[in-house]
Amino acid sequence: DAEFRHDSGYEVHHQKLVFFAEDVGSNKGAIIGLMVGGVVIA
């Protein structure tokens, strides 16, 4: 099974979860996926 890394910052908008990557240099703040249940799809 695939593994998923869950970063700690997120906001919920209209039942979607937008992840914000942390500690990744110039990519800080980038949207990296939508969430369904406990799984993010990048």
Epitope: A2, K16, I31, G33, L34, V36, G37, G38, I41, A42
Partner: antibody, heavy 117, light 111 residues
Framework: EVQLQQSGPELLKPGASVKISCKAS????????MHWMKQSHGKSLEWIGG????????IYNEKFKDKATLTVDKSSRTAYMELRSLTSEDSAVYFC??????????WGQGTLVTVSA | VVMTQTPLSLPVSLGDQASISCRSS???????????LHWYLQKPGQSPKLLIY???TRFSGVPDRFSGSGSGSDFTLKISRVEAEDLGIYFC?????????FGSGTKLAIK
């Protein structure tokens, strides 16, 4: 109102491939993940995989990773699933679904795929 | 994650209470405290329809005779007074862990 309109039934020969479509309406297509399920002869349900319409990023059930390919066309708000190297084991109803953050699904009406020599 | 539903078949009389159990092979509690366990009803020739999500939240339009409970890996769906429109196959589903999985279904039928 959320609507997921799937393509019609398919009768195919073993070894063939098929591409099923699912046209979405009533919501912002890029805000939600799209998923596909398999239901064999009225039995239980299996999750095939899901796709993020923004990026085209996918996640598959390991069982189906060599069987199914998920894609989307954002311009037409349509999700697709291609099934390849079909066998009788692939005969089933396939459902397109829309996921939400809370983890549940809205379902299309289903597409019957029959594989027979 | 294996979802084990019992019973496979549940014969009832209209007006009876019905109870369906769903157990998961591991905890369905996600790191943020949510438990992504859901219940669907599928009637013959139709797609599944959501009844309950996240263990106990009734979906919009679902009658209050349906209730969900449980925690961790042990969950129950109760129908307080079965009506004819409730007949069909009930599935539990988990979306905490990939791959997402479903129970084998419980057929609610008239006794």
């Amino acid at each position: 109102e959320v609507q997921l309109q799937q393509s019609g039934p398919e009768l195919l020969k073993p070894g063939a491939s098929v591409k099923i479509s699912c046209k979405a309406s009533g919501f912002t297509f890029t805000d939600y993940t799209m998923h596909w399920m398999k239901q064999s002869h009225g039995k239980s349900l299996e999750w095939i995989g899901g796709i993020n319409p923004n990026s085209g990023g996918t996640i598959y059930n390991e069982k189906f990773k060599d069987k199914a390919t998920l894609t989307v066309d954002k311009s037409s708000r349509t999700a697709y699933m291609e099934l390849r190297s079909l066998t009788s084991e692939d005969s089933a109803v396939y459902f397109c679904t829309r996921g939400v953050y809370d983890g549940y699904f809205y379902w299309g009406q289903g597409t019957l795929v029959t594989v027979s020599a | 994650v294996v979802m084990t539903q019992t019973p496979l078949s549940l014969p009832v009389s209209l007006g009876d209470q019905a109870s369906i159990s769903c157990r998961s092979s591991q905890s369905l509690v996600y790191s943020n405290g949510n438990t992504f366990l859901h219940w669907y009803l599928q009637k013959p020739g139709q797609s599944p329809k959501l009844l309950i999500y996240k263990v106990s939240t009734r979906f919009s339009g679902v009658p209050d005779r349906f209730s969900g409970s449980g925690s961790g890996s042990d969950f129950t769906l109760k129908i307080s007074r079965v009506e004819a429109e409730d007949l069909g196959i009930y599935f539990c589903s988990q979306t905490t862990h990939a791959p997402f999985t479903f129970g084998s279904g419980t057929k609610l039928a008239i006794k």
